[in-house]
Interface confidence: low
């Protein structure tokens, strides 16, 4: 029998350029009579144009929703009701071709054409894009608060904030023809739930979304977004009601930046430069294409690309890369944003060099990508260390910490976290190396103690990049480095003259002069430690709540012992900057470290002194007794302590702790405590120092109170941020 044909709605969005009309400011105000009159005419013209083609039989509805410069650009959408089987045949490209063909056929015609009665439409200026009913609904919901802005070359335009009565607004932005728009978003409040979405076209087309940001992001307080061309739309959706705008938006046109380079690398190892997407750290734009050609001086070397919070992964060929596509020597890889460092190592087999291509495959983009490039020795990629094939990084081998996700850096170790004697491969503890006392059969532990040695897991790297064999040589009163750098920056780690810790004892004034109390409105929240004249280190999770993220809330007390009283040695500071580790992950507690810059430098005294920071190679031996201090609860669930408590804890082997916590302990964590519990940190101790005393009598910061199951529970150790695992970031910030 007869079967009715199934019809479907196909939605298109687009723009066209009118050559015989000029844009005026009146046309930006939807309530103006000029806008109403122009839309009526433009709508009529659009309908007539569509119905003049074979698309006419499918015409359903259309709307011109705004105007822009150029001389006059009309922005519109229309809906065609088409048979389902023809859906794929009427792609935006086909529809655009049909309409352009119609326009061209009447350019020189003297016959009366309805759609040319008032408008001279430029066939080359017609753009048709795919849209959806949902896109039109989103557009319509913003039209009550619609802003059009044209921004000229050399201008930076600050956009007027959203209408507080509206729940959604749209900024339609346009710039000069051959430029691209760069939008800058700066969050100004610590807490909000507003959502901003940026589009690479004039309206909110989901398929042309560049990015969307939500809720006063602390990790991205400033976001810069590039469009692929001179048009962009920004849609705001209201979050919590706030009289103050939680953000500032500004836009400027910028010239296209070429992203092609030919480089010849020098005959040396390590990083030699940086490649980045245009306008880094701006988000890369849709349609970005970069091509970098690097020539390597010899086949002894491979090319290393070191990424920050970005990794490359293999992807099935038919799936698009959502975070950037890379082709390296004809291998297709997809970018992936991660909270870890990553390196891609490219073996070199021919002197022709290596071409690296980066492409944004879809309109959705992300933070600009920057990569450090350099050479590595193909026969020995990680001298003295282990090459982790999972992430391309060189990691310490056989130090008792599984730095590589697959744990292979701790496999097949003859001596784990100990020194291997040359004579018979016996293992001796590290503090016995270069201590003046031969412990190996023929004294190999005391050889080469006065000279440079190849760098390795436990060697100390001097400022001149040479390495010394003696473990933990920092600040022990004896220069071991040729340049004496192991004895520099040693005004630290000494206790003053002095006669929430569970199972602890009360500290005396000056006993822990680096201890900080971080307070909000007079209430102790977290501990911390002074590490430099203007820097206090603490745990990132202290600022986890959005309400705790603003620097103005915090006061830092140093030289304090009692919470309920002040004494002359005590000093307080406001916080000028708060920096969380960029890889900090709330759920896993990984990289749980933050740095606070004080509003003025400390004046050192018996009660206020910094603790010593360890080198990356500093070895804190499991079994060592160290100390934690803080005003945390004296029992699980209890109130904080009035007096600064101290307790000794034992450093626990990583594999034992990892097992206790079911393998949730990362290489940036260190465990301390006792199998039977009792002595431990507790609520309120977070961010406080775990310090270990070196043979020199100086105290080194080993960890920061981070997490654990309960307080002082049997079988569950305290977990601390491992300072040696985050020391490079600390030094980068502080220096």
């Amino acid at each position: 029998g007869y079967k009715a044909e199934v019809m479907v709605s196909q939605v298109y969005s687009g723009s066209l350029r009118v050559l015989n009309r000029h844009f005026s400011q009146d046309l930006t105000r939807r309530e103006s009579s000029a806008f109403r009159s122009e839309t009526a005419k433009a709508q009529k013209m659009l309908k007539e144009l569509i119905t003049s083609t074979r698309l006419g039989t499918y015409y359903n509805s259309s709307s011109v929703y705004s105007f822009g410069e150029g001389p006059l650009t009309c922005f519109f959408w229309f809906i065609l009701q088409i048979p389902e089987h023809r859906r794929l045949m009427l792609s935006p490209e086909v529809v655009q071709a049909l309409l352009v063909e119609e326009l061209l056929s009447t350019v020189n015609s003297s016959a009366a054409v309805p759609y040319r009665a008032e408008y001279e439409v430029d066939p080359e200026g017609l753009v048709i894009l795919e849209a959806s009913v949902k896109d039109i609904a989103a557009l319509n919901s913003t039209l009550g608060c619609y802003r059009y802005s044209y921004v000229g070359q050399g201008q930076v335009l600050r956009l007027k904030g959203p209408d507080h009565l509206a729940s959604s607004c749209l900024w339609h932005l346009q710039g000069p023809k051959d430029l691209m728009l760069k939008l800058r978003l700066e969050w100004t409040l610590a807490e909000c739930r507003d959502r901003l979405a940026m589009y690479d076209v004039a309206g909110p087309l989901e398929k042309r979304l560049i990015t969307s940001v939500y809720g006063c992001s602390r990790q991205e307080p400033v976001v810069e977004v590039l469009a692929s061309g001179a048009i962009m739309a920004v849609v705001w959706k209201k979050g919590l009601h706030s009289y103050y705008d939680p953000f500032v938006l500004s836009v400027q046109p910028v010239v296209f930046q070429a992203c092609e380079v030919n480089l010849t690398l020098d005959n040396r190892l390590d990083s030699q430069g940086v490649l980045s997407t245009p306008y880094f750290p701006s988000y890369y734009s849709p349609q970005t294409h970069c091509s970098w050609h690097l020539t390597v001086p010899s086949l002894d070397y491979g090319l290393a690309l070191w990424f920050d919070a970005y990794a490359l992964r293999r992807q099935k060929y038919d799936l698009p890369c959502t975070q950037g596509q890379w082709t390296i020597q004809n291998r297709r890889l997809c970018g992936l944003r991660i909270l870890q460092p990553y390196a891609e190592r490219i073996p070199v087999v021919a002197t022709a060099g290596i071409t690296i291509n980066f492409t944004s495959q879809i309109s959705l983009t992300g933070p600009g990508v920057r990569v450090h490039y350099g050479l590595y020795n193909q026969s020995d990629p990680c001298p003295g260390e282990f090459l982790c094939s999972v992430n391309g990084l060189c990691v310490p081998a056989c130090d008792g910490v599984k730095d590589c996700p697959n744990g292979l850096d701790e496999r097949n170790c003859v001596c784990r976290a100990t020194f291997q004697c040359k004579e018979d491969s016996t293992c001796i503890s590290l503090p016995k190396v270069c201590d003046g006392q031969p412990d190996c059969l023929n004294g190999s532990d005391e050889e080469q103690c006065q000279e440079g040695v190849p760098c390795g897991t436990f060697t100390f790297q001097c400022e001149d990049r040479s390495c010394v064999k003696k473990p933990n040589p920092q600040c022990d009163g004896r220069p071991d480095c040729r340049d004496g750098s192991d004895e520099e920056h040693c005004d630290c780690g000494l206790q003053g003259p002095s006669s929430r810790i569970v199972g602890g004892a009360v500290s005396s004034e000056g006993e822990w002069p680096w201890q900080a109390s971080l307070q909000v409105r007079g209430r102790h929240i977290c501990g911390g430690a002074l590490i430099a004249d203007r820097w206090v280190i603490t745990a990132a999770h202290c600022f986890q709540e959005d309400s705790m993220a603003s620097t103005v809330l915090w006061t830092v007390f140093l030289g304090k012992v009692w919470q309920n009283s002040r004494w002359p040695g005590e000093v307080s500071f406001k916080v000028s900057r708060l920096l969380l580790h960029p890889y900090h992950e709330e759920d896993s507690h990984d990289y749980d470290v933050a740095l606070l810059q004080l509003d003025h430098p400390v004046v050192r005294s018996a009660a206020v002194r910094p603790v010593c920071l360890p080198a990356r190679s500093h070895f804190f031996e499991p079994g060592l007794h160290c100390w934690i201090t803080g005003w945390g609860a004296l029992r699980e669930g209890g109130p904080i302590s009035n007096a600064l408590q101290k307790v000794d804890v034992q450093l626990i082997p990583q594999d034992l702790c990892s097992e206790v916590y079911r393998y949730q302990v990362t290489p940036r964590m260190l465990c301390a405590g006792y199998r039977k519990g009792k002595k431990d940190a507790c609520q309120g101790d977070s961010g406080g120092p775990l310090v270990c005393k070196a043979l020199s009598g100086r105290w080194f910061l080993a960890g920061l109170v981070s997490w654990g199951l309960g307080c002082g529970r049997p079988n569950y150790f305290g977990v601390y941020t491992r300072i040696t695992g985050v020391i490079s970031w600390i030094q980068q910030v502080v220096t």
């Epitope: 034992q650 082997p653 594999d655 034992l656 097992e659 206790v660 079911r662 393998y663 006792y674 199998r675 039977k676 049997p714 079988n715």
Partner: antibody, heavy 121, light 106 residues
Framework: QLQLQESGPGLVKPSETLSLTCTVS??????????WGWIRQSPGKGLEWIGS???????YYNPSLKSRVTISVDTSKNQLSLKVNSVTAADTAVYYC?????????????WGQGTLVTVSS | SYELTQPPSVSVSPGQTATLTCSGD??????VCWFQQKPGQSPLLVMY???KRPSGIPERFSGSNSGNTATLTISGTQALDEADYYC?????????FGGGTKLTVL
């Protein structure tokens, strides 16, 4: 309730490889709370720990046996295996498998009934 | 390597208290468990985490551990308690058993 049953050849020739299987019933070997261990007891002697394994593949071995021992699990069969290479008469013993508390408080409970392996030509 | 030392034998009259000891360097920092083994049988756990009794183990069994010595005490010893007793602890990455004590009920 949980039961463990060791099986394998009762006689192995010197220098050959001893292979035993422990089949677990009444509980999953892939439980995240437990390790699974092998212990042996030479005739008239005390208990000697051979090694322990977590279902994800993490293993710990007795240092004195480490070079000759391999422990593995097959979670699909709910089985634990032991291989000891290059055996000598000193490897003659009753071999037990046991479930071990996973958090290094270290107790073994329950135990299999044990299987006697004699190394002799 | 870490060692646990137990006396080879202990004798006790029925109804008396038997005290079995296990010593090792800083053993009190570690947890200790105890196994009972009767001839021809598999070991049976009688005490774990120093002082905890598995279900089914009589109340006359008790344990303690401090300093360098762990103790298993059997009060009101019965003839059926006659067996070999092994202590066990962890050291770093290894499980360590004591050499065992033969308890004889006279």
């Amino acid at each position: 309730q949980l039961q463990l049953q060791e099986s394998g050849p009762g006689l192995v020739k010197p220098s050959e490889t001893l292979s035993l299987t422990c089949t677990v019933s009444g509980g999953a070997i892939s439980s995240s709370n437990y390790f699974w261990g092998w212990i042996r007891q030479s005739p008239g002697k005390g208990l000697e720990w051979i090694g322990s394994m977590y279902y994800t593949g993490i293993t710990y071995y007795n240092p004195s046996l480490k070079s000759r021992v391999t422990i593995s699990v097959d979670t699909s069969k709910n089985q634990l295996s032991l291989k000891v290479n290059s055996v000598t008469a000193a490897d003659t013993a009753v071999y037990y498998c046991a479930r071990q508390d996973g958090f290094r408080t270290g107790w073994f409970d329950p135990w299999g009934q044990g299987t006697l392996v004699t190394v002799s030509s | 390597s870490y060692e646990l030392t137990q006396p080879p034998s202990v004798s006790v009259s029925p109804g008396q208290t038997a005290t079995l000891t296990c010593s090792g360097d800083k053993l009190g920092d570690n947890y200790v468990c105890w196994f009972q083994q009767k001839p021809g049988q598999s070991p049976l756990l009688v005490m774990y985490q120093d002082t905890k009794r598995p279900s089914g183990i009589p109340e006359r069994f008790s344990g303690s551990n401090s300093g360098n010595t762990a103790t298993l005490t059997i009060s009101g010893t019965q003839a059926l308690d006659e067996a070999d007793y092994y202590c066990q602890a962890w050291d770093s990455r290894t499980v360590v058993f004591g050499g065992g004590t033969k308890l004889t009920v006279l």
